[in-house]
């Protein structure tokens, strides 16, 4: 038969950050190719990445149609010379992925501090709202648009001259914190979805940004904007 020498895919794994979602699997193909299918629990199978020699398939376009649905994918293995007209009636070997619910399982991407501004003993720190590939009508939505108040940010801040960190939390993208006069501070933020109970509750920390660096001096009486 046409599928005798093909092996089923294995180690099917979802890799997803801010809803950019790729299914990966093994093995690297030798004389075989793969086709991926994806469906919701109640939907029909849709084929993607037809007869590919890759071991990954970008399924973002499918999952962003409804990020709160649960999806299942499967990977079919075909002989490398396979074309649809071969007439083989035997079902090719395939393997199912774990279920995947994007809203609950996509990883939070590393956030970025957009700006900070000091006025006297207050500093306003703003976190950049990341764009996702989720759409409403023809408009791309931001991370905040999708997660709303499910998403919070944690700010870690410390005096440049010491290592003792303080924290603040916000369910917006802004922090207003008290600082000591005449001291320079460093900042890092982390995105968090508190209602998650798994390892993907938190993003990695943002790059550290410090006051008083060459992009502009903070002035106790003035404003300091730090933009990427």
């Amino acid at each position: 038969s046409g599928t005798t020498n093909t092996v089923a895919a294995y180690n099917l794994t979802w890799k997803s950050t801010n809803f950019k979602t790729i299914l990966e699997w093994e093995p690297k193909p030798i004389n075989q190719v793969y086709t991926v299918q994806i469906s919701t629990k109640s939907g029909d199978w849709k084929s993607k990445c037809f007869y590919t020699a890759d071991t990954e398939c970008d399924l973002t376009d499918e999952i962003v149609k409804d990020v709160k649905q649960t999806y299942l994918a499967r990977v079919f293995s075909y002989p490398a010379g396979h074309v649809e007209s071969t007439g083989s009636t035997e079902e090719p070997p395939y393997e199912n992925s774990p279920e995947f619910t994007p809203y609950l399982e996509t990883n939070l991407g590393q956030p970025t501090i957009q700006s900070f501004e000091q006025v006297g003993t207050k500093v306003n720190v703003t976190v950049q709202d990341e764009w996702t590939l989720v759409r409403r009508n023809d408009t791309f939505l931001s991370l905040r648009d999708v997660f709303g108040k499910d998403l919070i940010y944690t700010l870690y801040y410390w005096k440049s001259s010491s290592s003792g960190k303080k924290t603040a939390k916000t369910n917006t993208n802004e922090f207003l914190i008290d600082v000591d006069k005449g001291e320079n501070y460093c900042f890092s933020v982390q995105a968090v979805i508190p209602s998650r109970r798994t390892a993907n509750r938190k993003s990695t920390d943002s790059p550290v940004e410090c006051m008083g660096h060459e992009k502009g001096e903070s002035r106790e009486t003035g404003h300091h904007h730090h933009h990427h």
């Epitope: 629990k41 409804d66 709160k68 649905q69 649960t70 619910t101 809203y103 609950l104 703003t126 976190v127 709202d129 409403r136 939505l141 931001s142 991370l143 905040r144 648009d145 999708v146 997660f147 709303g148 108040k149 499910d150 998403l151 369910n171 917006t172 993208n173 802004e174 508190p194 209602s195 998650r196 109970r197």
Partner: antibody, heavy 120, light 113 residues
Amino acid sequence: EVQLVQSGSELKKPGASVKVSCKASGYTFITYWIEWVKQRPGQGLEWMGDILPYSGSTNYNENFKGRATFSADTSVSTAYLQISSLKAEDTAVYYCARSGYYGNSGFAYWGQGTLVTVSS
Amino acid sequence: DIQMTQSPSSLSASVGDRVTITCQSSQSLLSSGNQKNYLTWYQQKPGKAPKLLIYWASTRESGVPSRFSGSGSGTDFTLTISSLQPEDFATYYCQNDYTYPLTFGQGTKLEIK
């Protein structure tokens, strides 16, 4: 079609407890917050709190902390509101509602309401 | 907690009228991250559950007639019904959907003149 179907009316004595159920269908139950809203006769709407069935994570309005408890059974797609030590002022219609698809986009679907009457 | 204040508390109008209901929040409902206002409007008829009309201050929920529109930003918001229909006589509520605890306005009862 998204539906939230609540349990029937209840008549309870002061000091008793009541458990209201809200059976969801037509959507992925675990990914949407279930909201609970109280409406006393002839009065406005009061948000009690919410629960995310996926994790059991809850938020409570301080006015209801202690006597109201939210729970969810994902195997039967049902959320529950339990109120203990009932008082006359707990007489109200209790609604469950489902959060919208987008972040902070309101309560898109509502149950029909459950009337709880507390009277001796 | 964010307080929501609606005005007027009640309002009499006729079919075909243009009606405006206002809602004021004690704190800004504008999200700095995405520049959206998390203010929601509902309609409720006697003996029925509320119905979502508008979210994000100005986005009409699917299936809601175009005569309903929402506007405003920060702390001041408006629900406008451009030409009242018989089925629009009901009570309208605004809601803070920005931060916990979520809070409703006291309601505006729209009655037939």
